[in-house]
Amino acid sequence: EEELQIIQPDKSVSVAAGESAILHCTITSLFPVGPIQWFRGAGPARVLIYNQRQGPFPRVTTVSETTKRENMDFSISISNITPADAGTYYCIKFRKGSPDTEFKSGAGTELSVRAKPS
């Protein structure tokens, strides 16, 4: 089994308020087994944006079809962006367990929000 890498290709993404933001994340291996989660921010104050094993997350949809058994694309789209959504988003692989434990994080994608065009 190859070592898991988490690829967040975009260092930054800029989106106009009211639009949708696509945050890209691909993994290179299904192992270790466990869910993908997205967070805004780091450390104890980070905010859960999406968790593969639970939901729903009304403003968040996955870009690819995560029900495919071999899926390794966990990019997400966040709708109706507001200035409060600005921040750095991390795609994180968890290892299954009770509870699941954080295994590896992507480098992060900084989302900036532009004013809505008049």
Epitope: F31, P32, V33, P35, Q52, E65, T67, R69, K96
Partner: antibody, heavy 118, light 106 residues
Framework: DVQLVESGGAVVRPGETLRLSCTAS????????MSWVRQAPGKGLEWVSG????????YYADSVKGRSTISRDNSKNTLYLRMSSLTAEDTAVYYC???????????WGLGTLVTLSS | ALTQPASVSANPGETVKITCSGG?????YGWYQQKSPGSAPVTLI????KRPSDIPSRFSGSASGSTATLTITGVQAEDEAVYYC???????????FGAGTTLTVL
Amino acid sequence: DVQLVESGGAVVRPGETLRLSCTASGFTFSSYAMSWVRQAPGKGLEWVSGISASGSDTYYADSVKGRSTISRDNSKNTLYLRMSSLTAEDTAVYYCARETWNHLFDYWGLGTLVTLSS
Amino acid sequence: ALTQPASVSANPGETVKITCSGGGTSSYYGWYQQKSPGSAPVTLIHSDDKRPSDIPSRFSGSASGSTATLTITGVQAEDEAVYYCGGYDYTTYVNTFGAGTTLTVL
């Protein structure tokens, strides 16, 4: 409430073809992967086939590979299993089941009986 | 293949543990109850330890390494059934089941 109702079971002769259906209600069918699981008389459960939410990707047990086709019509909330070249070993109750995020099962239908008789 | 005991028995009120092994660390496990042959299975546990909201709290699941365990705390007469463990293997994209464990409540 989630409901899965199978139909199409019948008494058939060896070598014939049969199509089973499973009609779903109570959830957003197009968002979930689905599977068929069977149980031969006096035996345990055997996974037969699975399909991704859009229907683009399909998966089969070795015991049916090459002579079975799983498909779905999301506009009709219906899952199908077409089985050809049937043999006595295919005699079983066939259940459709909804998959969880990690391809286990959370809801099951009541089953439909397929009997091979020469 | 997943391995589980063929049968277990217990008195009402006792705690029963049914084990399932052989899935490896690349598997998730689920537990399914079937009260009579040919009747619809009911999911008790999925994702190793997740219990659907309509399942009584006396049923719990756990997994360590390549072994999963279903625990029934305070077994009741109505729990008499066959219990199947099931697994999904990320290396093969295939679901497998154990042969089933018959629980007899004495």
